[in-house]
């Protein structure tokens, strides 16, 4: 039994942290294999976590942690048994994929006006809770063309629009993600898309 | 109320041992890092020993190696440190510490401290 | 083994004024892992910042840490009376435990 594909980490720097490998074959990850792990850091101790089957030779293991400092480092040792298969280290901090945002909600009543709101995936005594920013994705379902992304750049998690930059009497849906710019991180997953009907009064026309 | 509550100080002639105790109340002993500071009569905070959630790992200052043992008894919510060979310089107020995880090393839970007098 | 000195030894300070406790480490470590204590006679130690600048619960916001590297700082920004006492900081690291020998902050 061997490694094809080394492990590789990403953290959500907050409790998780999801490392993924390939066995050069067939493995029942949750049976045959275990990562070790253990935070570098006068008497932490080992943590075991039992891996899930991530494709036929692919494996999985979501690594559970207290929190999240930038200096962490920990040490990962990959088990079948016991023979050692796979040494390594990483650092939380600079694998970051942030939490997908949720709770996104579309407030049509404003004067014409689309009003964007989600919730912060994480607590304010989070690091990464005043870094984030966000890109919201809208689309139409009636025509895939209309496809378009804003980024939102400031720290508030919301987004006004003018209803009328949009198509009337059509639905469209929505999702947002984030990134945190001070670790360099991957984009979030999107968050659950949510629906609505766009209408809006047209101006009158003058003649 | 979080409290831990050393004891078992007192006068001891230099070589000989002294076992000190510290009960926890008010949390689970077993989800925290415990360790023993101590104080000498007008000086500083010194570090003396430290042991691991499960007693796995334990860890000494340089000046106490080879003479203390540190131990713990987590379903009794218990720690202790066994002193043998003890010298004038241990004289001191030894406290009682816990450490949060999340603090990362802050010592955010202290005992009042038991005194540990050598002398002959 | 990391070495931290705490400068001032004695700090001579009037209430209201603004205090500044320096703490240098013989090499450059983590900021996660400095914290800071205060100490009155007779008592235990309590714990101010850890993380170098995050209070611990509890703790008034004219107490405040920062620093990076090899240089640390312990501000209180208006001195109280309940305030003059003992400060320590203290690197809790990977591999050691080690204290700076104090500051006394006394009244003026």
């Known amino acids: 039994m061997k490694v094809l594909q080394e492990p590789t980490c990403v953290s959500d720097y907050m409790s998780i942290s999801t490392c993924e490998w390939k066995m050069n074959g067939p493995t029942n990850c949750s049976t045959e294999l275990r990562l070790l792990y253990q935070l570098v850091f006068l008497l932490s101790e080992a943590h075991t976590c039992i891996p899930e089957n991530n494709g036929g030779a692919g494996c999985v293991c979501h690594l559970l942690m207290d929190d999240v400092v930038s200096a962490d480092n920990y040490t990962l040792d990959l088990w079948a048994g016991q023979q050692l298969l796979w040494k390594g280290s990483f650092k939380p901090s600079e694998h970051v994929k942030p939490r997908a945002p949720g709770n996104l909600t579309v407030h049509t009543n404003v004067s014409d006006t689309l009003l964007l709101t989600w919730s912060n995936p994480y607590p304010p005594d989070n690091y990464l809770y005043n870094h984030l920013t966000y890109a919201v994705n809208i689309w139409s379902e009636n025509d895939p063309a209309d496809f378009r992304i804003y980024n939102v750049t400031y720290l508030e998690p919301s987004l006004r629009i003018a209803a009328s930059t949009l198509k009337s009497g059509i639905s469209y849906r929505a999702r947002v993600r984030a990134w945190a710019q001070c670790y360099n991180t991957t984009w979030s997953e999107w968050s659950p898309s949510t629906k609505w009907h766009n209408s809006y009064r047209e101006p009158f026309e003058q003649h | 109320e979080v409290q831990l509550l050393e004891s078992g100080g007192g006068l001891v002639q230099p070589g000989g041992s002294l076992r000190l105790s510290c009960a926890a109340s008010?949390?689970?002993?077993?989800?925290?890092?415990m360790h023993w500071v101590r104080q000498a009569p007008g000086k500083g905070l010194e570090y003396v020993s430290g042991?691991?959630?499960?007693?796995?790992?334990?860890y000494y200052a340089n000046s106490v190696k080879g003479r203390f043992t540190i131990s713990r008894d987590n379903p009794k919510n218990t720690l202790f440190l066994q002193m043998s060979s003890l010298r004038a310089e241990d004289t001191a107020v030894y406290y009682c510490?816990?450490?949060?995880?999340?603090?990362?090393?802050?010592?955010?839970?202290w005992g009042q401290g038991t005194t540990v007098t050598v002398s002959s | 083994e990391i070495v931290l000195t705490q400068s001032p030894g004695t700090l001579s300070l009037s209430p209201g004024e603004r205090a500044t406790l320096s703490c240098r480490a013989s090499?450059?470590?983590?900021?996660?892992?400095l914290a800071w204590y205060q100490q009155k006679p007779g008592q235990a130690p309590r714990l101010l910042i850890y993380g170098t600048s995050r209070r611990a619960t509890g703790i008034p916001d004219r107490f405040s840490g920062s620093g990076s590297g090899t240089d640390f700082t312990l501000t209180i920004s208006r001195l109280e009376p309940e305030d003059f006492a003992v400060y320590y900081c203290?690197?809790?690291?990977?591999?050691?435990?080690?204290f700076g020998q104090g500051t006394k902050l006394e009244i003026k």
């Open positions: 203290q690197l809790y690291g990977a591999t050691s435990v080690t």
């Open positions: 042991i691991s959630h499960s007693g796995n790992s334990t």
């Open positions: 090499q450059s470590v983590s900021t996660a892992y």
């Open positions: 008010g949390f689970t002993l077993s989800s925290y890092a």
């Open positions: 510490v816990r450490v949060k995880r999340r603090y990362r090393g802050g010592m955010d839970v």
